[in-house]
Interface confidence: medium
């Protein structure tokens, strides 16, 4: 018996061939011997089966001795043995229809779980295998679960159902809702304007929700909410903002925040959360601010940084075009009795300068000038 696999919602064509290459009488029946369709001369006739409005044939092939049964908009319950009667012969074809669906929305938050459920006809014992867009293979039976979805899991999942050495393939588009970056760090000199950007890693027609930025300043004992906002059809409106600092927020996506000036008391870490309408859970992006200050007080030239710096970062003080006078893996360095000239304070990571602040030291009879 020939086995044919079909996909729920698709169209399948079951073949039936006579030895004579001409139009002769044929009938297609189901396993209960109920007539589905056949012919009377050159006319297509249909029987009382439940497939009535979804069954068809190709009259153009009858003259070649081919009498296919076409079933449209396949349903799981169409799985059956179909019998073609032609020239006193019976050709049996077993049709097995499968469906694969995501049992929740196909738009899922980063970290959530995806469950794919296989609908299969009674008596079948298929195995399913899916491959994610990043090339991760997973295998299962009637259900297949993937926990802790990552951004790279966004895209088309290719799933293969195997039954009786035959395969049928499904494609499911999954969108993982997340920010493009889990974490970012901004390096600024004291007094500079700070831009925080929170680009999303997905695009949807309408985006509605609400968000908040909580900030833990390095100098503060507890975190506080700096701003809350609403998002309606990709339009941003501020609900509440602190007076110090007074953040400004862009009205359109991507989410964009401006801190008028970087000050040591603002250095620290923030967590922007975004709750989307009709979704449980929130999107998160961490943002860090590192602030640098270079000062000269009497005979002491000091360079300091505040905020979450890695222990491998190097802080240096050097006179322009000269070797570093002092270089330490610390958050403050200083030089006593600095020579006159333009001094540079540098924060660097493996030789790459992340932040630079210049201060002019005048001869001892003058006062310092900070450009």
């Amino acid at each position: 018996k020939k086995v044919v696999l079909g996909k729920k919602g698709d169209t399948v064509e079951l073949t039936c061939t006579a030895s004579q290459k001409k139009s002769i009488q044929f009938h297609w029946k189901n396993s209960n011997q109920i007539k589905i369709l056949g012919n009377q001369g050159s006319f297509l006739t249909k029987g009382p089966s439940k497939l009535n409005d979804r069954a068809d044939s190709r009259r153009s092939l009858w003259d070649q001795g081919n009498f296919p049964l076409i079933i449209k908009n396949l349903k799981i319950e169409d799985s059956d043995t179909y019998i073609c009667e032609v020239e006193d012969q019976k050709e049996e074809v077993q049709l097995l229809v499968f469906g694969l669906t995501a049992n929740s929305d196909t738009h899922l938050l980063q970290g959530q779980s995806l469950t794919l459920t296989l609908e299969s006809p009674p008596g079948s014992s298929p195995s399913v295998q899916c491959r994610s867009p990043r090339g991760k293979n997973i295998q299962g039976g009637k259900t297949l679960s993937v926990s802790q979805l990552e951004l790279q899991d966004s895209g088309t999942w290719t799933c293969t159902v195997l039954q009786n050495q035959k395969k049928v393939e499904f494609k499911i588009d999954i969108v993982v809702l997340a920010f493009q970056k889990a974490s970012s760090i901004v390096y600024k000199k004291e007094g500079e304007q700070v831009e925080f950007s929170f680009p999303l890693a997905f695009t949807v027609e309408k985006l509605t929700g609400s968000g908040e930025l909580w900030w833990q300043a390095e100098r503060a004992s507890s975190s506080k909410s700096w701003i809350t906002f609403d998002l309606k059809n990709k339009e941003v409106s501020v609900k509440r903002v602190t007076q110090d600092p007074k953040l400004q927020m862009g009205k359109k996506l991507p989410l964009h925040l401006t801190l008028p000036q970087a000050l040591p008391q603002y250095a620290g870490s923030g967590n922007l959360t975004l709750a989307l309408e009709a979704k449980t859970g929130k999107l998160h992006q961490e943002v860090n601010l590192v602030v640098m200050r270079a000062t000269q007080l009497q005979k002491n030239l000091t360079c300091e940084v505040w905020g979450p710096t890695s222990p491998k970062l190097m802080l240096s003080l050097k006179l322009e075009n000269k070797e570093a006078k002092v270089s330490k893996r610390e958050k403050a360095v200083w030089v006593l009795n600095p020579e006159a000239g333009m001094w540079q304070c540098l924060l660097s990571d493996s030789g790459q300068v992340l932040l630079e602040s210049n201060i002019k030291v005048l001869p001892t009879w003058s006062t310092p000038v900070q450009p």
């Epitope: 195995s127 295998q129 491959r131 990043r134 290719t158 293969t160 195997l162 050495q165 393939e169």
Partner: antibody, heavy 118, light 108 residues
């Protein structure tokens, strides 16, 4: 008889391009994942690329952005377009079939040699 | 990236002896996605075992595979002269689909 035959190897200068082909016969080509695997002289096997039955493609970091795998089911053919070639790409390149339902690489070609040298 | 390490690098044995080859993964691999290959000089590799323990078509039953998680083993119960070759394990559970560096089985 199930068979894979690679062609297109040769000598190319660093920075140059080459297109490898793999002709498949004896099986329904469109039903199988196909892979390229390479082996430098005296070294082990290194996976280079995979193309799924749905046309989905996968590469390791070492070739990503330089190599492109493609398939032409109507011609039972697999291809590997290799650009910006480096000396480190010198190897025998094998075309292989992914076994039914991704179960290992069950059919291999005889390989074609690519030499990148000035 | 899942790294595979094979041990020993070389196994020197005589025909008739038992060979035990190890493949260790840097992170857990579903046993469904672990394969073993044999390669002789000047030839393409040949699939021996897929799914960690299933023999490929035409592979003699002296070859067997076992293991799960991060530790997998290929056993050749009685070495035949034609079994002296290099053996590679491969994981195809997660891209990049890495191979182990190989174990050479040679004559003692």
């Amino acid at each position: 008889e199930v068979q894979l035959v690679e062609s297109g190897g040769g000598l190319v200068q660093p920075g140059g391009s080459l297109r490898l082909s793999c002709a498949a016969s004896g099986f329904t080509f469109s039903n199988y994942d196909m892979h390229w695997v390479r082996q430098a002289t005296g070294k082990g096997l290194e996976w280079v690329s995979t193309i799924g039955t749905a046309g989905d493609t996968y590469y390791p970091g070492s070739v990503k952005g330089r190599f492109t795998i493609s398939r032409e089911n109507a011609k039972n053919s697999l291809y590997l377009q290799m650009n910006s070639l480096r000396a480190g790409d010198t190897a025998v390149y094998y075309c292989a079939r992914g076994g039914d339902f991704y179960y290992g690489l069950d059919v291999w070609g005889q390989g074609t040699t690519v030499t990148v040298s000035s | 990236e899942i790294m595979l390490t094979q041990s020993p690098g070389t196994l020197s044995l005589s025909p008739g002896e038992r060979a035990t080859l190890s493949c260790r993964a840097s992170q857990s691999v579903s046993s469904v996605y672990l394969a073993w290959y044999q390669q002789k000089p000047g030839q393409a590799p040949r699939l021996l075992i897929y799914g960690a323990s299933s023999r490929a078509t035409g592979i003699p039953d002296r070859f067997s595979g076992s293991g799960s998680g991060t530790d997998f083993t290929l056993t050749i119960s009685r070495l035949e002269p034609e079994d002296f070759a290099v053996y590679y394990c491969q994981q195809y559970g997660s891209s990049p689909f890495t191979f182990g560096p190989g174990t050479k089985v040679d004559f003692k």
